[in-house]
Interface confidence: medium
């Protein structure tokens, strides 16, 4: 399908002008290539009428032009002095007329209505309000005022000053007679319907002295605003319906093939399941306007959208609406990234978030989509640091790999972490993306102690066991803080024979703290990565305490990675069994809040690993 997009139908009246905007993917080639507007003939050929290279056909001379806006990826064709002969089928496109990078546009030019002399024309959108002004002479001031609608040769009474209201206008029309001295009465019609379209007659008095004024009311369906967005990107519909409906329920709906409108979201709590996790209805402003954000755009999201107001929270005739025609460009600049990331309870996920690579300095954010209250998104972490304290020790936002992608790592997963998360920046809002985290059955691949109590001044060795599939990955330990995870210095011992054969005993990377200080207290992560792409992580909390007398419970300060056959040494001192390495009951129960101000560093902390080879791929 062509990525060029424009209005499908354009209608106007003889003598008027039209402006037709066409969109294209703003690639370097597209920005500079020829743009054209051509008319389709009976033979199927498309004859150029105007192009960006300065050509204007004789038929269009002096009344048409084409302007390219390469920075926006749009071009505009303006045609003036329209005649009935301009009605027909056209194409706006790029390159050669026959190449297919084009969009079909139907132009219909109709004859303007023949109106009686002195007719006032009122042009109003459906659902809005019109005020018809009706002048009269002094002698008719005390006489009956009325508004009629002309239907064929007959005139049907709509409203008069004797309190008659036509049933078709019930509860939405009023006639206002001003105070003395003002020789004008007004008729206000609210919530205009398409059927209200037509010629009206104001009348004051009767007989030959009566005052009459014709009014032509043109009720228009709102012209849809064209919206051109990239696949996987984000769109925002700003809906301004006016103060008169400020306190009425609002909705966004999508027009279906039956020309009815399916609610996408409304302020009464309804939401289409197809938009679960990727839609927010932002609260309305004091003027009654509101906005709807949709992320993770799909090709099937294309179509005509209407926003409106009605107490039922859905489309009803005669209520104000606003319209958009959404086109989703498949030649997207937004890279593919997983829309679903799976993790196991106790394990971790590493989420890749795209951003506009031109905005590398932008602030990065990650928020958790909540379905309550029309959708909202509390920030969890940003590139400046952690936002929500309940994620302490298990969430980090990394600028890597960079060049249009940042990484968010979440570990110590529970079933409550399942849900939709949004990747955001303070730059180009079209790059908002959505990822769903699913918690599946399984065991974490990296095994670390549940938590560890270290003894001040002694040596602590924390093991991290990994499976063979991570043998070629880079292994690391880092100390978590609310601004990131500081990698600890590594002592590479080089690949051993045992490691090449993925020996049982070699699948281990250990963190050594020697000697343990108060500043070492906090969260530590063991992880695997491949270059700048992060895989799984496992977290362990290290509490630091004074040396205790015999009988107190602590992990052996000399080593926390005992061999599989080691057992309880005495009533209080227990070493870690390999198969139970995740069992937190083997460690001190207390969980001390991490001091994130100081980092473990220097030669006191070291990481022992059997390999320094590069990571072979992401763990998820």
């Amino acid at each position: 399908k062509s990525p060029v997009f424009g209005p499908q139908e354009v209608s106007s009246v003889e003598g008027n002008s039209v402006s037709i905007k066409c969109y294209y993917p703003p690639t370097s080639v597209n920005r500079h290539t020829r743009k054209y507007w051509c008319r389709k003939g009976a033979s199927g050929r498309c004859i150029t009428l105007v192009s960006s290279e300065g050509y204007v056909s004789s038929n269009y001379a002096g009344r048409a032009n084409l302007t390219n806006f390469p920075e926006n990826g749009t071009f505009v064709v303006n045609i003036a002095q329209l005649s009935r002969d301009d009605s027909g089928h056209y194409k706006c496109g790029l390159g050669i007329n026959s190449r297919g990078l084009s969009f079909d546009v139907s132009l219909e030019v109709s004859q303007g209505p023949e109106l009686p002399n002195g007719t006032e024309v009122y042009t109003v959108d459906v659902g809005r309000t019109v005020t018809i002004k009706c002048p009269f002479k002094t002698e008719n001031a005390p006489k009956t005022k009325a508004l009629y609608k002309k239907i064929g040769q007959t005139s049907v009474l709509v409203i008069d000053s004797r309190n008659y209201v036509n049933p078709n206008y019930k509860d939405r029309i009023r006639l206002r007679i001003p105070g003395t001295g003002q020789l004008i009465f007004t008729v206000v019609i609210d919530r205009l319907r398409l059927s209200d379209h037509g010629l009206y007659l104001c009348q004051a008095g009767d007989g030959s002295n009566r005052d009459e004024k014709n009014a032509d009311l043109q009720v228009l369906e709102p012209e849809p605003e064209l919206v051109y967005e990239d696949l996987r990107g984000s769109v925002t519909f700003h809906c301004a319906l006016g103060l008169e409906v400020a306190n009425v329920a609002k909705f966004l709906c999508r027009v279906n093939s039956r020309e009815t409108c399916d609610v996408v979201i409304n302020t009464l709590g309804k939401r289409d399941s197809a938009f679960e996790g990727r839609i927010l209805l932002n609260p309305q402003d004091k003027d009654g306007s509101f906005s709807v954000v949709i992320t993770g755009l799909r090709k099937e999201d294309e179509g005509r959208y209407l926003c409106g107001a009605h107490s039922d929270g859905q489309l009803q005739e005669g209520w104000p609406i606003q319209a958009w025609q959404l086109f989703v460009n498949e030649e997207s600049t937004i890279p593919r990234s997983p829309t679903v990331v799976k993790g196991v309870a106790g394990g971790s996920v590493a989420v890749l978030c795209p951003y506009n690579p031109k905005e590398s300095q932008s602030l990065k954010y990650w928020c958790l989509w909540e379905g309550a209250q029309n959708g909202r998104c509390p920030l969890l972490v940003e590139s400046q640091g952690l936002v929500q304290e309940q994620y302490e020790g298990r969430l980090s936002l990394l600028q890597e790999p960079g060049n249009g992608t940042f990484t968010v790592i979440l570990n110590q997963l529970t079933t409550q972490d399942a849900g939709f998360y949004w990747c955001l920046t303070n730059g180009d809002t079209r790059w908002r993306t959505t990822v769903e985290i699913k918690i599946i059955e399984g065991e974490p691949n990296l095994k670390v102690p549940g938590n560890v109590t270290a003894v001040l001044g002694e040596t602590l060795n924390i093991p991290c066991h990994f499976p063979c599939k991570f043998s070629s990955y880079e292994k690391y330990w880092c100390k978590w803080s609310n601004t990131g995870c500081q990698t600890l210095p590594s002592q590479d011992e080089g690949p051993s024979e045992a490691f090449v054969n993925c020996d049982e005993n070699s699948r281990l990377v250990s963190l050594t703290l020697n000697p343990v200080t108060r500043a070492d207290e906090g969260w530590y992560w063991c992880g695997v990565k491949q270059g700048h792409f992060y895989g799984e992580t496992a977290a362990v909390y290290v509490a630091v305490e004074e040396k205790k007398v015999a009988g107190s419970r602590y992990v052996s300060p000399a080593k926390a990675d005992a061999a599989p056959d080691e057992k309880v040494l005495d009533s209080g001192v227990r070493e870690i069994e390999n198969k139970a390495i995740q069992d937190p009951r083997l460690f001190a129960e207390e969980k001390v809040v991490a001091d994130t101000g100081d980092q473990a560093g220097g030669s006191r902390a070291s990481v022992d690993s059997s390999s320094s080879e590069e990571q072979g791929g992401s763990s998820k």
């Epitope: 932002n282 928020c367 920030l379 400046q384 929500q388 949004w422």
Partner: nanobody
Framework: QVQLVESGGGLVQAGGSLRLSCAAS????????MGWFRQAPGKEREFVAR????????DYADSVKGRFTISRDNAKNTVYLQMNSLKPEDTAVYYC?????????????????WGQGTQVTVSS
């Protein structure tokens, strides 16, 4: 959390105007919904106004609609409350607050960062 400091309060006659400022430090307020609350002597703290992350959506208490305007300058990391046609009943300590919600409906309970407040006194 973001640190907030209010300024611009003072004594003003009924019908007069004041502009309160709220300067944020510690981190940018871009992703935050920001709000103003007030507490009159012997009364509970009440909502005055809020503004979303982009400044495109605002909301006001009925008692201040049409008189107060909330705005923000993300580049300056500052939120403002322009108060016109002040009334004696507007006398209170005004607090600036931040809520770490990028978007969507935010209830008053969701505001987690608070300033120390600035006194506004309107004399009749």
């Amino acid at each position: 959390q973001v640190q907030l400091v209010e300024s611009g309060g003072g004594l003003v006659q009924a019908g007069g105007s004041l502009r309160l400022s709220c300067a944020a430090s510690g981190r940018t307020i871009y992703g935050y919904v920001m709000g103003w609350f007030r507490q009159a002597p012997g009364k509970e703290r009440e909502f005055v106004a809020r503004i979303d992350w982009s400044g495109s959506s605002t909301d006001y208490a009925d008692s201040v609609k049409g008189r107060f305007t909330i705005s923000r300058d993300n580049a300056k990391n500052t939120v403002y409350l322009q108060m016109n046609s002040l009334k004696p009943e507007d006398t209170a300590v005004y607090y600036c607050a931040g809520s770490a919600y990028y978007s969507g409906y935010v209830t008053h309970r969701d505001f987690g960062s608070w300033g120390q407040g600035t006194q506004v006194t309107v004399s009749s």
